[in-house]
Structure formats: C-alpha cells, structure tokens
Interface confidence: low
C-alpha cells in the first residue's frame, strides 16, 4: 500500500503522457487522478512504465472501481492486464469479443496463464456457449484451447462452431473429448460432398464409431496412417480386412510399420490369418486358418 502524500506543486497530471515515467511511485499515487487514468487508459500502453509504476496505476483503478472495472477500462488495459489476479478478473463482466481479443493479444506467445483462463471462463459463461466467433478467436491465440476443455464443457459447443476448428486445434485432444466433438462435426459437415466431407471430418475421426468407418470405407477416401492410428480401438476392431483395405487405399502398406502398435496390433489379433495374407504385407498374429471365430462382442457386453 502506497502512503497518502500531497502532490508537489506543479506536478498534478493533466494528461496521461510520457512525463509520468519520471514520477516516483508516491508522486504517481498523489498526482494522477484515478478518473483521468480511467478515461485515458488507451495511452498507458504506449508509455514505458516500470512494473512498480504499473502497480500504482492498478491500485488507483482498484480504488476507483472496487466492484470491478467497467468494460470501457478493461478493453484498454494493455500490459496492465498482466498485473491482474484471477480474483480481480472474476469481478469483471466482459461481453465484447474485441475486449477479449485485446487482452489475449497482451498475453500472446505465452502459456495460458490463470488470469487468461479466468478471463476466458468469464467471457464464455457470459455468452452462454462457445459460439463460432469466440472459438475462432480462442483457438487462434491458443491452438490447444479446445483440448483443455472437459468433455462436459465441450458439449456446450454448438455444431456451427466446429467450422472454426483447425486440425492443429485437436492435436492434444484425448478420445473422450473427440467422442463429444465428432458427432458435432458430423452434423456440421453433413451437407458436403464425399471428398470435401472427408477433408473436414478427418481430424475428428478419433471419435467415430465403427458404422461410420465402414461407411467411409465405401467412399474411396484413402485415409492416411496417422489418422488411422488415432481411431478408437473399439471402433477399428470390428472392421474386416477388406474394409480396412478400402479405407486406407494406397496407404494400406503402412500397416506393416504399425503392426506392433494399437489399434493395428489389436485389429490383427481379431482377423483370420488367411484374410491378412491377402494384403501381401506379411502381417502376422491373425487367427490361424481352421479355427472357429467367436463373436466376442456379445461376450464383452456380458462381462
């Protein structure tokens, strides 16, 4: 807390300008009117204040707005945003996407800090859902943002927002998250033709069920191995050798390199060896010829 001291004669600030960088902390406290600061916040960012001086300016705003800053001030906080605590931010009511963008810009290139996480949380809760424009903005600044949400939070993403999602935004999503996102993507892209649809849906296929993979195998999509390896094991297991061959197209030879890894490893164990041999890849570990193949799905459902 800065002591209350009288402003020296002639030092009362009439404007927020560069002359203030020469003020000591106590002079800033005594000579800068909080209301003036609030109306000229846009100037603060252009002035090279020290961290200590920014602390004083924050203190003045906190005194002026004990219940939380108005959006007109928040939008122009600039580097002063980095001084805010999550507790400060929880008092705010941020409704403008422009305000959100301005504050995210300040933190650009850094990890998502607790302050930013709180800001985003407040903004999204205020809007009621993750609309397309918000998602577009958040993933532009934080490509991993979508995958940092719980499956429950993702369920509030409307299908229309899926158009804003880029493949790299899904890099760190786990299967449970893709389980939620995939049906939304399927709905969002349902009116596209075959090849265009596959390009868009590809990144979400880690959440696709068996029947959708079977349908894709009939459409000459030529899925690459990187995508195939991200598919749900339980969705891949029921696929026949012929279906996998159609699904992968020319990429089918890549199965050999992946034969020790899930889901390929587990899929091989469920196939007849003579069916695997038709691929000509030397895949081993299938069910020997002449053995009875039980339908394990019912057994698994009962266990």
């Amino acid at each position: 807390e800065v002591e209350k001291t009288a402003c020296p004669s002639g030092k009362k600030a009439r404007e927020i300008d560069e002359s203030l960088i020469f003020y000591k902390k106590w002079e800033l406290e005594a000579c800068v009117d909080a209301a003036l600061l609030a109306t000229q916040m846009d100037r603060v960012n252009a002035i090279p204040f020290t961290y200590e001086q920014l602390d004083v300016l924050k203190h003045k705003l906190d005194e002026l707005y004990p219940q939380g800053y108005p959006e007109s001030v928040i939008q122009h906080l600039g580097y002063l945003f980095l001084k805010m605590s999550p507790e400060d931010i929880r008092k705010w009511n941020v409704t403008s996407l422009e305000t959100l963008k301005a504050l995210l810009e300040v933190n650009k290139g850094h990890e998502m800090s607790p302050q930013v996480a709180t800001l985003i949380d407040r903004f999204v809760k205020g809007r009621g859902q993750l609309d397309k424009d918000t998602l577009d903005t958040l993933t532009a600044f934080y490509p991993g943002y979508l995958c940092s949400l719980s499956p429950e939070e993702l369920s509030s993403v409307p299908p229309s927002s899926i158009w804003a999602v880029r493949p790299q935004d899904l890099d760190t999503c786990d299967p449970r998250q893709l389980d939620v996102l995939y049906p939304k993507a399927r709905l969002a892209f349902q009116n596209m033709n075959g090849s265009e649809y596959f390009v868009k849906i590809q990144s979400f296929l880690g959440g696709a069920p068996t029947e959708d993979l079977k349908a894709l195998s009939q459409q000459n999509v030529s899925m690459d191995l990187a995508t195939f390896m991200k598919l749900r094991t339980d969705a891949v297991l029921p696929l026949t050798v012929a279906e996998v061959q159609k699904l992968l197209g020319p990429h089918v030879e890549g199965l050999k390199a992946e034969e020790r890894h899930r889901p390929v490893r587990d899929w091989i164990l469920r196939q007849r060896q003579d069916d695997l041999d038709t691929l000509g890849l030397g895949l081993q570990g299938g069910i020997p010829n002449g053995y009875l193949v039980l339908d394990l799905s019912m057994q698994e459902a009962l266990s």
Partner: antibody, heavy 114, light 108 residues
C-alpha cells in the same frame, strides 16, 4: 516461478524398479499434457511417454511399453514414471517436460548396472 | 516410424557468423516441428515451435523456416552464448515424438 523438479533417480540392478517423481509449480499443472524424455549422457534426446490432462490417456515409446507406467496426481501437482524390469540401456538422465514443451525439469539420473 | 535427420552433426563457427542447421523428416510433418538448444549439464530449452514461431523470451537472432520434410534453424549473428547442441523435434505424427540426433555448434 515456473518449475519442474524431478526426483527418484539412482542406481538400480538390471530387472529392478524405480519410481521417478516430478513436482510442478508456478503454472496450472492440471491444464497440460506432460511428458518424460530421456538422454544417455553424450547422446541425443529420446521421448519416453506422455499423459493427458486428467491421466486417462497414456502413450509410450516402443522401447519402454509394458515396462514403464506414466501417471499423475493433479491434486499434488506431481507427475510419476514407474519403471519396472529395468535394463542396462535404460541408463540415462530422465527429464520431465510440460507446458507445451516449454518447461523442462533439471533431470534425474537413472543408472542400471550390476 | 518417422526419422528426423539433422545436418551437419558438428558445425564450427565464429562469433558474428550466420549459422544454418537443417532438419529433414522421413515423411511430411506439415509445420509440426520444434527446435531446442541444450548446453552441457542443462535441460533443453525450447527456441522455436510450429517450424517458425519464436518462443517467448528467445532472442530474435534465432529463426526457423520450412514445411513438409525440410526445415532450417538460422542464427543470424552467432553470439558467445549460442555455442551449444541444437535438436529438432517432430510432433506431426502423434502419438510418437521424434528428435533429430543433434547438431553441435562449436567455436572455430
């Protein structure tokens, strides 16, 4: 400040076990995927394993699959690597990595030798 | 599995030199490549991610470029603090992450 501190390394006989720990501070541990990377002294970096934010998804390098187990305790801000059936070629400095690969620990040395 | 090959293995240079290190991927990884710097006895430090994005706090003399299978790390004017080992790392073919074998930048 943002920090990862590994512990639990040491000398162990082939076939033995060790449990490495990595204590995180200064960032929201529960928001990030975490990794273990190892390095034989004088050699290159080798990725070992990763775990997602809530611990439900884990992945391993072929060389350690079935022997090593990665886990995390978000309440304690700690990452673990349980290493069983250790072999001579597991001897290395083990690094804990997080924060989208921007945050690395100082490393802990594991020596497997009879 | 995807292979990452760095060249040269060792590079002798002087302070002020422009230095370029190359990293080749055995298959396309789009722009999913990172560069790290490691000094003796220390942990690696992230310099560049997404092929060309400079990590916060890293001097602007470091830059990255490339896409697909060919990538380069450039140090525009080598400083005394830059003598170290540099590694590339792919994260375009998850779930596996692969590092290059490293390039040692030493004093000429």
């Amino acid at each position: 400040q943002v920090q990862l501190v590994e512990s639990g390394g040491g000398l162990v006989q082939p076939g033995g076990s060790l449990r490495l720990s990595c204590a995180a501070s200064g960032f929201t541990f529960s928001s990030y995927w975490m990794h273990w990377v190892r390095q034989v002294p004088g050699k290159g970096l080798v990725w070992v394993s990763r775990i997602n934010t809530d611990g439900s998804t884990t992945t391993y390098a072929d060389s350690v699959e079935g022997r090593f187990t990665i886990s995390r305790d978000n309440a304690k801000n700690t990452l673990y690597l349980q290493m069983n059936s250790l072999r001579d070629d597991d001897t290395a400095v083990y690094y804990c990595v997080g924060g989208h690969w921007a945050v690395w620990g100082q490393g802990t040395t594991v020596t497997v030798s009879s | 599995d995807i292979q990452m090959t760095q060249s040269p293995s060792t590079l002798s240079a002087s302070v002020g030199d422009r230095v370029t290190i190359t990293c080749r991927a055995s298959q396309s990884i789009s722009d999913r490549l990172a560069w790290y710097q490691q000094k003796p006895g220390k942990a690696p430090k992230l310099l560049i991610y997404k092929a060309s994005s400079l990590e916060s706090g890293v001097p602007s003399r470091f830059s990255g470029s490339g896409s697909g299978t060919e990538f380069t790390l450039t140090i525009s004017s080598l400083q005394p603090d830059d003598f170290a080992v540099y590694y590339c790392q792919q994260y375009g073919h998850l779930p596996m992450y692969t590092f290059g074998q490293g390039t040692k930048v030493e004093i000429k």
